[in-house]
């Protein structure tokens, strides 16, 4: 039984970590800083044109283990790194693109990459 005065509504975990964000900034972010109860991340990925675009932001605790694990996706070159050790720790993350497959250098079947689109297009 709840003590008197104690709310029965689930209490949100405090958002304690501040992260640099770029192209993943929530609407309430100020000066390209977001807050999270989870992780900061920096990601490098090829956009549709093959350009290596870097984005960064906050990941909520829910599901972030999976997102930070950076499981390879076929035909998509991307890499993500996460951190929690201090505010804006993702400024110092430096994920690198996985190497190109040999098939990209010889005429062969075309592989279309599937992207989750960001707020920019190249």
């Amino acid at each position: 039984k709840k003590e008197d005065g104690e709310s029965t509504a689930p209490t949100a975990r405090p958002k304690v970590l501040r992260c640099k964000c770029h192209h993943h900034c929530p609407e309430d972010s100020v000066n390209n800083i977001c807050s999270t109860d989870g992780y900061c991340f920096t990601m490098i990925e090829e956009d549709d044109s093959g350009t290596p675009v870097v984005t960064s932001g906050c990941l909520g605790l829910e599901g972030s283990d999976f997102q930070c694990r950076d499981t390879p996706i076929p035909h998509q070159r991307r890499s993500i790194e996460c951190c929690t050790e201090r505010n804006e720790c993702n400024k110092d993350l430096h994920p690198t693109l996985p190497p190109l497959k040999d098939r990209d250098f010889v005429d062969g079947p075309i592989h279309h990459k599937h992207h989750h689109h960001h707020h920019h297009h190249h």
């Epitope: 770029h22 490098i44 090829e46 044109s49 093959g50 984005t55 990209d104 075309i110």
Partner: antibody
Framework: QVQLQQPGAELVKPGASVKLSCKAS????????MHWVKQRPGRGLEWIGR????????KYNEKFKSKATLTVDKPSSTACMQLSSLTSEDSAVYYC?????????WGTGTTVTVSS | DIVMTQSQKFMSTSVGDRVSVTCKAS??????VFWYQQKPGQSPKALIY???YRYSGVPDRFTGSGSGTDFTLTISNVQSEDLADYFC?????????FGDGTKLELR
């Protein structure tokens, strides 16, 4: 080895058009987008636009929208840029450039001279 | 359009020196910046992508840094073959835009 070959020079008359070519070799042409860049002495570099060789989709710098037309010929792995209504302002070196992730290759450049 | 400003048009250096070429974006471009080297009569050559990632084959004396609006290309232990023009380019939004370039010359 990834290479982009461009003709060395084109001499054209004011008001005329010219079609510049950029032949790609050493990679799958349709997987790298092709960019075009203009360089005039002492004026730095200007991005004209880019084309997706697979779909033919283009994106232009507004400044060059009525000046440049980008196309590709997939069978010959060649990207082309047509420049129209040429004036002395269009005299420049034009580069094609292709990139994919951590590879970035520029063509040798074509010098376009507009003169009567 | 995003303006990329390279305030120093010329920089004098000596072989063995360390030199920093700077570039300022008119708005936040994250780390989506290229650095190019161009020698007379040659095409530009890409040195750095995503502000700090060195292209394969580029000597490690070339280092890129910065994020947001301020970017730096540092050449440590300058060699005579490094004398060239250096351009930054943002690719965070269209149209892609270049700095006007900085010419590195011998003192």
């Amino acid at each position: 080895q990834v290479q982009l070959q461009q003709p060395g020079a084109e001499l054209v008359k004011p008001g005329a058009s010219v079609k510049l070519s950029c032949k790609a070799s050493g990679y799958t042409f349709t997987t790298y987008w092709m960019h075009w860049v203009k360089q005039r002495p002492g004026r730095g570099l200007e991005w004209i636009g880019r084309i997706d060789p697979n779909s033919g989709g283009t994106k232009y710098n507004e400044k060059f929208k009525s000046k440049a037309t980008l196309t590709v010929d997939k069978p010959s792995s060649t990207a082309c840029m047509q420049l129209s209504s040429l004036t002395s302002e269009d005299s420049a070196v034009y580069y094609c450039a292709s990139r994919r992730g951590d590879i970035d290759v520029w063509g040798t450049g074509t010098t376009v001279t507009v003169s009567s | 359009d995003i303006v990329m400003t390279q305030s120093q048009k010329f920089m004098s250096t000596s072989v063995g020196d360390r030199v920093s070429v700077t570039c300022k974006a008119s708005q936040n471009v994250g780390t989506n910046v290229f650095w190019y080297q161009q020698k007379p009569g040659q095409s530009p050559k890409a040195l750095i992508y995503a502000a700090s990632y060195r292209y394969s084959g580029v000597p490690d004396r070339f280092t890129g840094s910065g994020s947001g609006t301020d970017f730096t290309l540092t050449i440590s232990n300058v060699q005579s073959e490094d004398l060239a023009d250096y351009f930054c380019q943002q690719y965070d939004s269209y149209p892609l835009t270049f700095g006007d370039g900085t010419k590195l010359e011998l003192r």
